[in-house]
Interface confidence: medium
C-alpha cells in the first residue's frame, strides 16, 4: 500500500485522492470514523467507489496487515448467502456468523466477521485509480 | 450447533448468595457482537431481565437490582456467571440465560436468539 | 421504564382460525439510530422462550410464515395466521430500544 512515504517516495505513487491509498490499479479508504454499514455505503457512492468489495486471498491478506483489530466494514451482505455488493459471491474465504440477524460483513487483521448492519463501525471505501 | 445451559443451587436460605452458571457451546464468548444476558420468570408470572455481560466484559445490570447482582464470565470455559447478594423468597423464580446479539448499544439489545432450558431456584427458611 | 402492555392476557382460539394479539408500549420504542426493537417471543409449557419476530415484522429462521408481525412508533400487532396446536403457550412482546429492555405481562393461546 503506498501512502506518502510510508512504503515509498510519493513520486513514485500514481495519484489516489488525500487520504486514500494506492495498491495495485486501487484506491483504498480506510475511515477513521464510524458509521452503520448503509451509512458507510453511502459515503464510498458519493465519493465514485464502493464499499471494499475483496477479490482474492492476496488483496485479503495485504488489506489485513494494515487493519488493526477494530473491525470494518465490507461490501458484503448475507442475502440468500453471503455476497459482495456486486453481487459475486463470497468463495476465496469464510466469513465468521454467529446469528442469522447478522447481515452485514466486517473485516480486521484476523477475520472477516458478520455483524448485525446497524452497529457502528469503521469502513473501508475502493475504487480504481486515476 | 448453539447451545446455553443454566445450573444453580436449586434451594437456598435468605440473605445467602445466589451463584448461577450459563454454560455455552457452539459459539466464543469473545467473538466480537456476543453477549449473554440473564433472566428470571417467578412461577406462573412474566420475564423480568436482570443483566448481560458483552464480548468485551462489558457489563450492564437492572438499576433496580443493580447492587446485589454481579454478573461475569470466563470465555475460556465458555461460561457465564450471575451471583445475586442478600436473596429473599421474592428471588424464587426460574432463571434462564439467553445469547444476545450486539446492534451498536451496549445498554440494550434487540436479539435473544438462543435460550437455556432454566434452573430453578427456591428460596425459603 | 417503558412499560409494554399485551391484549388480550388470555386468547381461546380454535385451530386453523386465526389470532390477533396486540401489544402497546407507553412510550415510542423508535430507538434513536431509526430502528424499532421490537420482539415476540413463544413459550411453550415447561420449555424457555422462543424468538419468533425481531424488529417488528422480521421472522427469525425456522418459523412458519404464518406467523407475522407489524406496527410501529407504540402499536403493535402479532398475527397467527392458521393456529396449529404446537402454537399453544404464553407470547410476550420485548422492547430492547429503551434501558432497562422490558417484557410484556404474556398472552396465553389456548384452546377454546
Known amino acids: 500500500l503506498c501512502q506518502g512515504s510510508k512504503y515509498s517516495t510519493c513520486a513514485s505513487c500514481p495519484s489516489c485522492p488525500d487520504h486514500w491509498m494506492k495498491y495495485g490499479n486501487h484506491c483504498y479508504y480506510f475511515s477513521v470514523e464510524k458509521k452503520d454499514w448503509i451509512s458507510s455505503l453511502e459515503f464510498c457512492l458519493a465519493r465514485d467507489s464502493h464499499l471494499l468489495m475483496i477479490t482474492d486471498k492476496q488483496e485479503m491478506s495485504l488489506l489485513q496487515d494494515f487493519l488493526s483489530e477494530a473491525f470494518h466494514w465490507v461490501g458484503l451482505r448475507n442475502n440468500s448467502g453471503w455476497r459482495w455488493e456486486d453481487g459475486s459471491p463470497l468463495n476465496f474465504s469464510r466469513i465468521y456468523s454467529n446469528s442469522l440477524v447478522q447481515t452485514c460483513g466486517a473485516i480486521n487483521k484476523n477475520s472477516l466477521q458478520a455483524s448485525s448492519c446497524e452497529v457502528s463501525l469503521q469502513w473501508v471505501c475502493k475504487k480504481v485509480s486515476p | 450447533q448453539v447451545t446455553l445451559k443454566e445450573s444453580g443451587p436449586g434451594i437456598l436460605q435468605p440473605s445467602q448468595t445466589l451463584s448461577l452458571t450459563c454454560s455455552v457451546s457452539g459459539f466464543s464468548l469473545s467473538t466480537f457482537g456476543m453477549g449473554v444476558g440473564w433472566i428470571r420468570q417467578p412461577s406462573g408470572k412474566g420475564l423480568e431481565w436482570l443483566a448481560h455481560?458483552?464480548?468485551?466484559?462489558?457489563?450492564w445490570y437492572e438499576l433496580a437490582l443493580k447492587s446485589r447482582l454481579t454478573i461475569s464470565k470466563d470465555s475460556s470455559k465458555n461460561q457465564v456467571f450471575l451471583k445475586i447478594a442478600n436473596v429473599d423468597t421474592a428471588d424464587t423464580a426460574t432463571y434462564f440465560c439467553a445469547r444476545v446479539i450486539y446492534y451498536g448499544s451496549r445498554s440494550a439489545y434487540y436479539s435473544m436468539d438462543y435460550w437455556g432450558p432454566g434452573t430453578s431456584v427456591t428460596v425459603s427458611s | 421504564d417503558v412499560l409494554m402492555t399485551q391484549t388480550p392476557l388470555s386468547l381461546p382460539v380454535s385451530l386453523g382460525a386465526q389470532a390477533s394479539i396486540s401489544c402497546k408500549s407507553s412510550?415510542?420504542?423508535?430507538?434513536?439510530?431509526?430502528?424499532?426493537?421490537l420482539e415476540w417471543y413463544l413459550q411453550k409449557p415447561g420449555q424457555s422462550p422462543k424468538i419468533l419476530i425481531y424488529?417488528?415484522?422480521n421472522r427469525f429462521s425456522g418459523v412458519p410464515d404464518r406467523f407475522s408481525g407489524s406496527g410501529s412508533g407504540t402499536d403493535f400487532t402479532l398475527k397467527i395466521s392458521r393456529v396449529e396446536a404446537e402454537d399453544l403457550g404464553v407470547y410476550y412482546c420485548f422492547q430492547g430500544s429503551h434501558v432497562p429492555v422490558t417484557f410484556g405481562a404474556g398472552t396465553k393461546l389456548e384452546l377454546k
Open positions: 455481560i458483552w464480548w468485551d466484559d462489558d457489563k
Open positions: 412510550q415510542s420504542i423508535v430507538h434513536s439510530n431509526g430502528h424499532t426493537y
Open positions: 424488529k417488528v415484522s
